[in-house]
Interface confidence: low
């Protein structure tokens, strides 16, 4: 036997109190799939969260963060304070990147400069708190009579890269 509730579309719920009639979701609730026996409460974007997309009868509200903050977690479950480039957020607030590290975004962690020597290259441009080092050609490429130097590859250790 077919479940009578399977006929209830998204935006409704199967109301057992009304002989399994499809009732519209009440205000501030939604059902994103058919055949639901209840509607889910809409997410409310409060405080540091702001509404990116209003709740509808078929889809939940979506939040993002107010200026000066950025989203973290699946579906922007948290808002984290922005820092300046060259800083990272610690428990005590925004702190400058330590020497040898950089952060070129307003969020995320300071990350180590690329170690050019691992790729047999030399440092072409020194790193700063805000920027990674730029690796130049390998010393062999600079020897007399070497063919024209190709532009340096963009450089940093891959993985956990600058945001």
């Amino acid at each position: 036997l077919q479940d009578p509730c399977s006929n209830c579309p998204a935006g409704t719920f199967c109301d057992n109190n009304r002989n399994q009639i499809c009732s519209p979701c009440p205000p501030n609730s939604f059902s994103s799939a058919g055949g639901q026996r209840t509607c889910d409460i809409c997410r409310q974007c409060k405080g540091v969260f702001r509404t990116r997309k209003e709740c509808s009868s078929t889809s939940n509200a979506e939040c993002d963060c107010t200026p000066g903050f950025h989203c973290l977690g699946a579906g922007c479950s948290m808002c984290e304070q922005d820092c300046k480039q060259g800083q990272e957020l610690t428990k005590k607030g925004c702190k400058d990147c330590c020497f040898g590290t950089f952060n070129d975004q307003k969020r995320g962690i300071c990350r180590p400069w690329t170690n050019c020597s691992l790729d047999g290259k030399s440092v072409l441009v020194n790193g700063t708190k805000e920027r990674d080092v730029v690796c130049g050609p390998s010393p062999a490429d600079l020897s007399p009579g070497a063919s024209s130097v190709t532009p340096p590859a963009p450089a940093r250790e891959p993985g956990h890269s600058p945001q």
Epitope: G108, P112, L118, G159, H160, P162
Partner: antibody
């Protein structure tokens, strides 16, 4: 929701090239680095290269340096990985994966199977 | 490249029991800024890998608290306090201090 959707499976002849696409949705492509990882059947994953978030600069694993090109089309929110001079050892599932704000590959595409056969 | 070595390679576990996977790197993954550049991933059968733990000990969003990561330098451990049937798959450690490399994987199966 945040997701990466990759192009479908490919069958290529040895010596040919393959270009895999990876469409980002639910977030802004230029806010996060994009990496490419491949996995041959029964093997551990192998990192191929990445594209920097802001400026799209790329860096490749030494092993693929001469054969791989990573690009992106920000207007289409899509990243691409092209591998040339294919050989039988390149038969693998190729993944795009986003690097999260504090590191770690937090979102992965579903993978694209590339078969190399004459 | 940094070589990552996992043990055991196969791990049969009874549901509800704890499980532990070891990962050793050929050189220290602890950077002077205090981060261990090591992540843990789970690849369930027929699926893409999923992030469990980043920077050595931080649980990723949505990961149950039965998963925990510990260790520093060259020796790291992933612990599952009570294994559930859905935890079946291959667990990989991955270092990202230098060119990214993965461990060979540990296959967790239910006894």
């Amino acid at each position: 929701q945040v997701q990466l959707v990759q192009s479908g499976a490919e069958v290529k002849k040895p010596g040919a090239s393959v270009k895999v696409s990876c469409k980002a949705s639910g977030y802004t492509l230029t806010n996060y680095p994009m990496h490419w990882v491949r996995q041959a059947p029964g093997q551990r994953p192998e990192w191929m290269g990445w594209s920097n978030a802001g400026n799209g600069n790329t860096k490749y694993s030494q092993e693929f340096q001469d054969r791989v090109t990573i690009t992106r089309d920000t207007s289409a929110s899509t990243a691409y990985m092209e591998l040339s001079s294919l050989r039988s050892e390149d038969m693998a599932v190729y993944y795009c994966t986003r690097e999260g704000v504090t590191g770690g590959f937090d979102i992965w595409g579903q993978g694209t199977m590339v078969t190399v056969s004459s | 490249d940094i070589v990552m070595t996992q043990s055991p390679l196969s791990l049969p576990v009874t549901p509800g029991e704890p499980a532990s996977i070891s990962c050793r790197s050929s050189q220290s993954l602890l950077h002077s800024i205090g981060y261990n550049y090591l992540d843990w991933y789970l690849q369930k059968p027929g699926q893409s890998p999923q992030l469990l733990i980043f920077l050595g000990s931080n649980r990723a969003s949505g990961v149950p608290d039965r998963f925990s990561g510990s260790g520093s330098g060259t020796d790291f451990t992933l612990k599952i306090s009570r294994v559930e049937a859905e935890d079946v798959g291959v667990y990989y450690c991955m270092q990202a201090l230098q060119t990214v490399t993965f461990g060979q994987g540990t296959r967790l199966e239910i006894k």
